[in-house]
Interface confidence: low
């Protein structure tokens, strides 16, 4: 799918209103510091694309991030500010209920979950200038995380 | 408050187009979608299609592809519907409806009166 | 197209009656919209994803489900409750079911 035609100021209201606080609560207990960002974007589509995969594609190591609610909030959100987005979900989606394991969390979906919040934080500042994975550690990060 | 008021009935011969106009009010008109849905006489609701006042994006049930075209005007806070090449399966009430974010799921909140089209010859 | 089955389609009870009224979809769905509509008018929200009363509704009024399977419950049924009720979803794209008529003997 390509998200080039997005409403991209929408879609960030629905990340700032729910989908952050939903990724924060399944990333509770564990440290920001924890796992090193390694996958990043260039523009709000590219984000959008890395966010859409590492959101609803099964990994190894972790099957079960689609019935999280932070995943079926950005499965709605780019369901209605995308268009053409969700006729282009529906054969995926059933492939993905197949290959779907028992909800557990592991550690290896606490940190594409973090990685998630890397991407989202991209997202919402896309003329940041890239300098690696320093760029998710700035000010605003803050209202990101869980401290423990 | 939040209005929709749609335009007025119709009577079209077979074959003819229509454009339909759905005036919002109340609101900025670019927050949010606006939905097009059909209701024949004593059937159920049909989803036509959704537009985004926003960017113009569209997103249409397969069936009424070629049959409606949505478009907006950001000018006058004004979504349109026009249906070409009119049979009297075209018969119907049209409702707008917009569809805002409530209770983590996009619901349509707010219905124009409907616009009745009668085809016939 | 996710397609949304209603049933019954007429729903006949006596005043204070509890009733419960059932959408079930062909794949499942994460939430599911209700609506009213009365002879003459635009429908209206009802009951916003599966669970949540619309501004207005009385708390008479009741929604839950999960996956393919969703219902609406009225617990004690009054007169002004005739209606259709149609359920929509948008999990992917947008459907309404083919509602279900409530008919107050």
């Known amino acids: 799918y390509d998200f080039t035609n997005c409403d991209f100021e929408k879609i960030k209201a629905a990340y700032l209103s729910t989908i952050s606080k939903d990724l924060i609560t399944y990333m509770s207990g564990t440290k920001s510091t924890e796992f090193n960002n390694t996958v990043s974007c260039s523009n709000r589509p590219h984000c959008l694309t890395e966010i859409q995969s590492l959101t609803f594609n099964p990994t190894a190591g972790c099957a079960s991030l689609a019935k999280e609610m932070f995943a079926m909030k950005t499965k709605a959100a780019l369901a209605i500010w995308c268009p053409g987005y969700s006729e282009t979900q529906i054969n995926a989606t059933q492939a993905m209920k197949k290959a779907r394991k028992s909800k557990v969390t592991t550690n290896k979906c606490l940190e594409q979950v973090s990685q998630l919040q890397g991407l989202w934080r991209r997202f919402n500042r896309p003329l940041l200038k890239q300098q690696g994975s320093s760029d998710y550690k700035d000010d605003d990060d803050k209202h990101h995380h869980h401290h423990h | 408050e939040v209005q929709l008021q749609q335009s007025g009935p119709v009577l079209v011969k077979p074959g003819a187009s229509v454009k339909m106009s759905c005036k919002a009010s109340?609101?900025?008109?670019?927050?949010?979608?606006m939905n097009w849905v059909k209701q024949s006489h004593g059937k159920s609701l049909e989803w036509i299609g959704i537009?985004?006042?926003?960017?113009?994006?569209?997103s249409y049930n397969q069936k009424f592809k070629g049959k409606a075209t949505l478009t907006v005007d950001k000018s006058s806070s004004t979504a349109y519907m026009e249906l070409n090449s009119l049979t009297s399966e075209d018969s119907a009430v049209y409702y707008c409806?917009?569809?805002?974010?409530?209770?983590?799921?996009?619901?349509?909140?707010?219905w124009g009166q409907g616009t009745s089209v009668t085809v016939s010859s | 197209q996710i397609v949304l089955s209603q049933s019954p389609a007429i729903l006949s009870a006596s005043p204070g009656e509890k009733v419960t009224m059932t959408c079930r979809a062909s794949?499942?769905?994460?939430?599911m919209h209700w609506y009213q509509q009365k002879p003459g008018s635009s429908p209206k929200p009802w009951i916003y994803?599966?669970?949540n009363l619309a501004s207005g509704v009385p708390a008479r009024f009741s929604g839950s489900g999960s996956g393919t399977s969703y219902s609406l419950t009225i617990s004690r049924v009054e007169a002004e409750d005739a209606a259709t009720y149609y359920c929509?979803?948008?999990?992917?794209?947008?459907?309404f079911g083919g509602g279900t008529k409530l008919e107050i003997k």
């Open positions: 409806a917009r569809e805002d974010y409530d209770y983590d799921g996009y619901a349509m909140d707010h």
């Open positions: 109340g609101y900025t008109f670019t927050d949010d979608y």
């Open positions: 794949s499942s769905v994460s939430y």
């Open positions: 929509q979803q948008w999990s992917s794209n947008r459907t």
């Open positions: 537009i985004s006042p926003y960017n113009g994006g569209t």
């Open positions: 994803a599966t669970s």
